[in-house]
């Protein structure tokens, strides 16, 4: 070996200076008598080496690197050898920081593994090999006096946690625990924890299960769930409090928390939930009232709440067939009585014959909002219910009675906008209990089965806005029937449009007679069309060759018109505009030429 490097310290604080010397022995005879020693840090040549010849003939170069800013680098001592650099010796330099104080030390007692697991945050990177050791001792008091030391716990490389096994633990007694961090630049220690391992016990959650239905037990109420849990075996005798959380599986609802529940409740009825809804449930527990840590949430249990019987009011209306008055068409509408009124699976219309106690005869069972059935001759009333798997709504009686009540008067209708009609009336005396308003297409498209209807519960109402199934340019028949205690009044009807259409085209103009200064025109009026409002007037327009325009307004019954004051031998463009309240339409243009002064009149 020709050269040897020695350094002031191979490991320094990052950014600190470092001094190195390189000595070349004299007996390296193949070298120049006065060789020039060069320094290289990594791949870069470093200036500043001070070289001298020592008394024993060896050459020495000393260099000071003012700041070592590499966390790891090789420092080489070299000579120029021909055209290349010859490395005589090199050393590895390292730079970094002493370990920061480990922080956030915390421990959990795991009863499954019977060990105390402690974890910490090591702090910023030191750039140097740093070892962590979990140190602990047993203590009788509050860790002021140190008892027996416990074997150091050394984590696996790169881990910031360590397990103290059961054989080194003393439960129900305090232990002093801290973390020591050490590297070449120093040692640091975390603040000491003083704890009884049982006070940091982290339990496992119970296992949630659905309760097996027992024949004698009542089924859960609507919006309720019956569940039970199996305690975690190692925590059987530990006092705990638990909490449940639940949320509907569908939608974005957040978890709702229920608790505290004693662990030993073991079974629980959870109510106040939405009926007929799938829920996700979880449970967790904590040692209580003694200290401890919350368990993780248990695996989810998914359960569905039972549904509730429909809570609806059924508004009803009926019609008899004209040809067969015993055939009744019954209509109904469910009106929710609560925000969650229960799912409706279907409807049943039934009749209870008098004298047959308990006998109920179903007349129809349907999922529709109407049904047609034959009314037994002695039947004056039927009952209608909505049902689902949980039961039925309160029965709605439907009484079939003659129209004996007074009629309403002055029934009228007017358009509000293209999709709504206002129907108004004068209430009869006495006030009815309410009204049924029916509407549907008028002739020629009229159909009893396609009518829409609404119940107006306010007997003092003097009108109703029809917003359902109203389209512009259609004629509607609106029928209003007053309802009384045990009867109804006669139905009244009125026809109306929500929006009428402008005439689709104006009549074609025809020239009947022409002269030098006049022209007689005629036209055949368009036949009236349903959905189109009647004509209010015509306007006739004529324009001469000089682009001067003239017009005249004619009433809707006009069939012709004579233009006077025309210029002889002149060209005119004429068109007719047919107008109604809904708009106007122009005819095609008729072009004509008046006769020359010497010409004879044409008739």
């Amino acid at each position: 070996e020709c050269g040897h490097i020695s350094v002031s310290a191979p490991i320094v604080h990052l950014g600190d200076p470092i001094t190195a010397s390189c000595i070349i022995k004299q007996n390296c005879s193949h070298l120049d008598p006065e060789p020039q020693i060069l320094w290289r840090l990594g791949a870069e040549l470093q200036p500043g080496g001070r070289q001298q010849r020592l008394s024993d003939g060896t050459q020495e170069s000393i260099i000071t690197l003012p700041h070592l800013n590499h966390t790891q680098a090789f420092l080489s001592c070299c000579l120029n050898w021909g055209n290349s650099l010859q490395i005589l010796d090199q050393v590895e330099l390292r730079a970094g920081y002493p370990p920061a104080i480990p922080h956030n030390l915390s421990c959990l007692m795991n009863l499954t593994t019977s060990s105390l697991i402690c974890q910490w945050e090591p702090g910023p990177e030191t750039h140097l090999p740093t070892s962590f050791t979990l140190k602990s001792f047993k203590s009788r008091g509050n860790c002021q006096t140190q008892g027996d030391s416990i074997l150091d716990c050394v984590p696996k490389d790169g881990q910031s946690h360590c397990c103290i096994p059961r054989k080194h633990l003393l439960l129900y007694q305090n232990m002093g625990i801290w973390v020591q961090a050490e590297n070449a630049l120093g040692t640091s220690m975390s603040p000491q924890l003083c704890l009884d391992p049982m006070d940091v016990v982290k339990l496992e959650p119970p296992m949630l299960r659905t309760m097996d239905p027992s024949p004698e037990a009542a089924p859960p109420q609507a919006g309720c769930l019956q569940l039970c849990w199996e305690p975690w075996q190692p925590g059987l005798h530990i006092n705990q409090k638990c909490e449940l959380r639940h949320k509907p599986q569908r939608g974005e609802a957040s978890w709702a928390l229920v608790g505290p529940l004693p662990l030993e409740a073991l079974q629980y009825e959870l109510c106040g939930l939405l009926p007929a809804t799938a829920y996700t449930l979880q449970i967790r527990c904590i040692r209580w009232p003694l200290p401890g840590h919350w368990s993780d949430w248990s695996p989810s249990l998914e359960l569905r709440t039972t549904e509730r019987a429909p809570t609806v009011r059924l508004d009803t209306w009926w019609r008899q067939r004209q040809l067969d008055p015993r055939t009744v068409q019954l209509f109904w509408k469910p009106v929710p009585l609560e925000e969650d009124s229960g799912r409706i699976q279907g409807y049943v219309v039934s009749w209870r014959p008098s004298g047959q106690a308990g006998a109920i005869l179903p007349l129809c069972n349907t999922t529709e909002l109407s049904c047609t059935f034959h009314l037994p001759s002695e039947a004056q009333e039927v009952a209608l219910v909505a049902y689902n798997s949980a039961g039925t709504s309160r029965p709605t009686p439907v009484v079939f009675s003659e129209s004996r009540g007074p009629a309403l008067t002055r029934l009228h209708a007017m358009a509000r906008d293209p999709h709504s009609l206002w129907v108004g009336w004068e209430p009869p005396n006495p006030w009815p209990q309410g009204y049924v308003i029916e509407w549907g297409l008028g002739p020629p498209s009229a159909s009893n089965s396609n009518k829409t209807w609404r119940m107006e519960q306010n007997g003092r109402a003097t009108g109703f806005l029809l917003k359902e199934n109203i389209r512009p340019f259609q004629l509607y028949e609106i029928i209003v029937t007053p309802l009384y205690q045990d009867t109804m009044g006669p139905s009244q009807h009125v026809y109306a449009y929500s929006q009428e259409m402008a005439p689709s085209h104006a009549p074609e103009l025809h020239l009947k007679h022409i002269g030098k200064t006049w022209a007689q025109l005629e036209w055949v009026p368009e036949p009236p069309e349903l959905g189109k409002s009647p004509l209010t007037h015509y306007t006739i327009f004529w324009t001469n060759a000089q682009n001067q325009s003239f017009s005249a307004i004619l009433n809707a019954s006009s069939r012709g018109f004579v233009l006077h004051g025309l210029e002889p031998a002149s060209l005119y463009h004429i068109h007719l505009m047919a107008a109604s309240q809904a708009g106007a339409t122009n005819s095609t243009v008729l072009t004509l030429m008046t006769l020359t002064p010497e010409g004879s009149e044409l008739h």
Partner: antibody
Framework: EVQLLESGGGLVQPGGSLRLSCAAS????????MGWVRQAPGKGLEWVSS????????PYADSVKGRFTISRDNSKNTLYLQMNSLRAEDTAVYYC???????????WGQGTLVTVSS | DIQMTQSPSSLSASVGDRVTITCRAS??????LNWYQQKPGKAPKLLIY???NLQNGVPSRFSGSGSGTDFTLTISSLQPEDFATYYC?????????FGGGTKVEIK
């Protein structure tokens, strides 16, 4: 002083009933499971029953199930064992004991002798 | 139900001897094993809980080990006051159960 004192033992005929009591003092009774352990003359220890801190969970040994009932009154710091349909084989010293969180009996009463004989 | 089997049922030993008693569970019970000492006419006394934890006031010559199904109570140097019957007990299940006992007598 932390202690448990049993009472209520004595001589009873087969088929008869007896109620044992155990008065606790010196610790927070309502926080702990409690239990009864018995020892027949010259025999080993036999677990009879336990009761959770609020009384909601009450496991029993098969040999006494349906005949014995364990209960507690946390307001009186007292544990009970109601013994019905007693048999000769129920003759034993009955110990009341406090259960620690890990299921160990860390405090015992002095025991009360129950003799079932005609 | 969990059965506990203790062995030997009795043993003779001299003061200063090292004594080992074993207890086997019919199924795994983790570390939920406790040891008791009972002297004639007295209530049992807790020695070791959770397999290896020494109860307060119990001399350090008593130690426990094991987990799962096999457990051991060791008295490192038998003292005159240690002649008694020793019981193991599992606390893994609601149904607690004891071993049959080991009587330690003077040789």
């Amino acid at each position: 002083e932390v202690q448990l004192l049993e009472s209520g033992g004595g001589l009873v005929q087969p088929g008869g009933s007896l109620r044992l009591s155990c008065a606790a003092s010196g610790f927070t009774f309502s926080l702990y499971w409690m239990g009864w352990v018995r020892q027949a003359p010259g025999k080993g220890l036999e677990w009879v029953s336990s009761i959770s801190s609020s009384g909601g969970v009450t496991p029993y040994a098969d040999s006494v199930k349906g005949r014995f009932t364990i209960s507690r009154d946390n307001s009186k710091n007292t544990l009970y064992l109601q013994m019905n349909s007693l048999r000769a084989e129920d003759t034993a010293v009955y110990y009341c004991a406090k259960l620690g969180e890990l299921g160990m009996y860390d405090l015992w009463g002095q025991g009360t002798l129950v003799t079932v004989s005609s | 139900d969990i059965q506990m089997t203790q062995s030997p049922s009795s043993l003779s030993a001299s003061v200063g001897d090292r004594v080992t008693i074993t207890c086997r569970a019919s199924q795994g019970i983790s570390s939920y094993l406790n040891w008791y000492q009972q002297k004639p006419g007295k209530a049992p006394k807790l020695l070791i809980y959770y397999a290896s934890n020494l109860q307060n006031g119990v001399p350090s010559r008593f130690s426990g080990s094991g987990s799962g199904t096999d457990f051991t109570l060791t008295i490192s140097s038998l003292q005159p006051e240690d002649f008694a019957t020793y019981y193991c007990q599992q606390s893994w299940a609601y149904g607690l159960s004891f071993g049959g006992g080991t009587k330690v007598e003077i040789k």
